[in-house]
Amino acid sequence: YNNFRKSMDSIGKKQYQVQHGSCSYTFLLPEMDNCRSSSSPYVSNAVQRDAPLEYDDSVQRLQVLENIMENNTQWLMKLENYIQDNMKKEMVEIQQNAVQNQTAVMIEIGTNLLNQTAEQTRKLTDVEAQVLNQTTRLELQLLEHSLSTNKLEKQILDQTSEINKLQDKNSFLEKKVLAMEDKHIIQLQSIKEEKDQLQVLVSKQNSIIEELEKKIVTATVNNSVLQKQQHDLMETVNNLLTMMSTSNSAKDPTVAKEEQISFRDCAEVFKSGHTTNGIYTLTFPNSTEEIKAYCDMEAGGGGWTIIQRREDGSVDFQRTWKEYKVGFGNPSGEYWLGNEFVSQLTNQQRYVLKIHLKDWEGNEAYSLYEHFYLSSEELNYRIHLKGLTGTAGKISSISQPGNDFSTKDGDNDKCICKCSQMLTGGWWFDACGPSNLNGMYYPQRQNTNKFNGIKWYYWKGSGYSLKATTMMIRPADF
């Protein structure tokens, strides 16, 4: 044969032309539309991606591949039929027209056709393997999706049951809250009613209180009048008793005293029912010895035993140790009760000491000591004070710790001088210290710049002499 060429016709079919001598053989083969030519950029593993395809996309592609396979199968069948038909025709023609040496050409053509068929078959096999691979992958993905779906379904079921539980709980709580609200409303109503009742009661009580206050004012006026009368009577009675006891003892010393209840201090007098200011007879602790004292039954709840009073300068306070020991002056006026009695009394239980002061300008102040006692004479009636409160200075004007008592004839101070002689009066001098309530009495307009006057430094300063002073004691548990 002269030549053999392959070309494409106008409609895209493959054309095999064989020239042999005067004879020319042309074979037309159909090209499948859905198949790629061997020269096309085809990658056999293009479907094997790392990232999984979406489920719907995979199904679509699978369908496309199935169609391709089906088309290929049909095409193969057509090709076989076509080859058989052509072979029959060719064989008839060859038998009719061909010479002996054309047999080789025919065999070559047959071989080429077989090669073509083999090539197509190989391609189909490749596609088939790819489809199978993709199918397997898709099956795995489907299985994964199925498992994931099952898991999600389980989670949804769990969450649904949880939501149901929470809804049940919520409804229970809502019911409870509603019940509580109802209860609260009822309580509020009852409270409102009670409030209204109380307001009525308060207004009633206010009117009663107003009436009582009016009555109290009237009673107070009457009481003060009665108290004055009683005080006057008491003084008269006391004077009479003194006169009678003097005259009786002069006439008949064997007449026994009328038995009477003894009081240790004014607090006991007060508790026995004697609640009027005045002079009362007190008995020394564990003794029959008596002493007269003035009792303040009004100030700060009453029951106060007055141990010192200055008010007008009528009594001389520049006295001896013995006089300060036993006491001197007039209990209804200026006086000193006595160190021995005060020492013994404050030895029995805890006492408080209150010192009340008046200046010449009409001002008053006080110092209150929560703890007070005097040591025995052996320790020079040393003063002990603790727990200061009051308006007469934040610092104690009686030196702390307490000092021994000193008089003009008993110098126990901490000064090389003799404070009692220099400043006059008996007192718990330091060296000489910030106070002396037993100093010289100076009248108004002569009371300033006096170093030896009635001094309470932390209220009025060093040179000011006070108008009036009162020292009083009472049991701490009164």
Epitope: P285, N347, Q348, H371, S375, E378, H384
Partner: nanobody, 120 residues
């Protein structure tokens, strides 16, 4: 002059006993309340026990310490049993009020103190 002199202190092992004495002079002893106080280093003086002239007493040591007095000898005693290391202190004798006060304020005469050391 009024004086109080303590004696009987010393070193003792934990669980042991000591008897402190306090002799008074120059004061009407029988009418005074006598008390024992102690002071550990860096701490305030604290009440231990007190006894009145008639013999009534009060203490703070849960029955381990007993106070007593002999008015004829003008002496007060403190018997300390089952001693603990925390009982280590200087023990002071004091004379005071006629009532059984626990506050140092109410005692106006003090001894110089005696050291008690309890080792563990």
């Amino acid at each position: 002059e009024v004086q109080l002199v303590e004696s009987g202190g010393g070193l003792v092992q934990a669980g042991g006993s000591l008897r402190l004495s306090c002799a008074a002079s120059g004061r009407t002893f029988s009418s005074s309340v006598m008390g024992w106080f102690r002071q550990a280093p860096g701490k305030e003086r604290e009440f231990v026990a007190a006894i009145s002239g008639s013999g009534s007493s009060t203490d703070s040591a849960q029955g381990r310490f007993t106070i007593s007095r002999d008015n004829a000898k003008n002496t007060v005693y403190l018997q300390m049993n089952s001693l603990k290391p925390e009982d280590t202190a200087v023990y002071y004798c004091a004379a005071g009020r006629a009532f059984l006060a626990r506050d140092t304020f109410y005692y106006d005469i003090w001894g110089q103190g005696t050291q008690v050391t309890v080792s563990s």
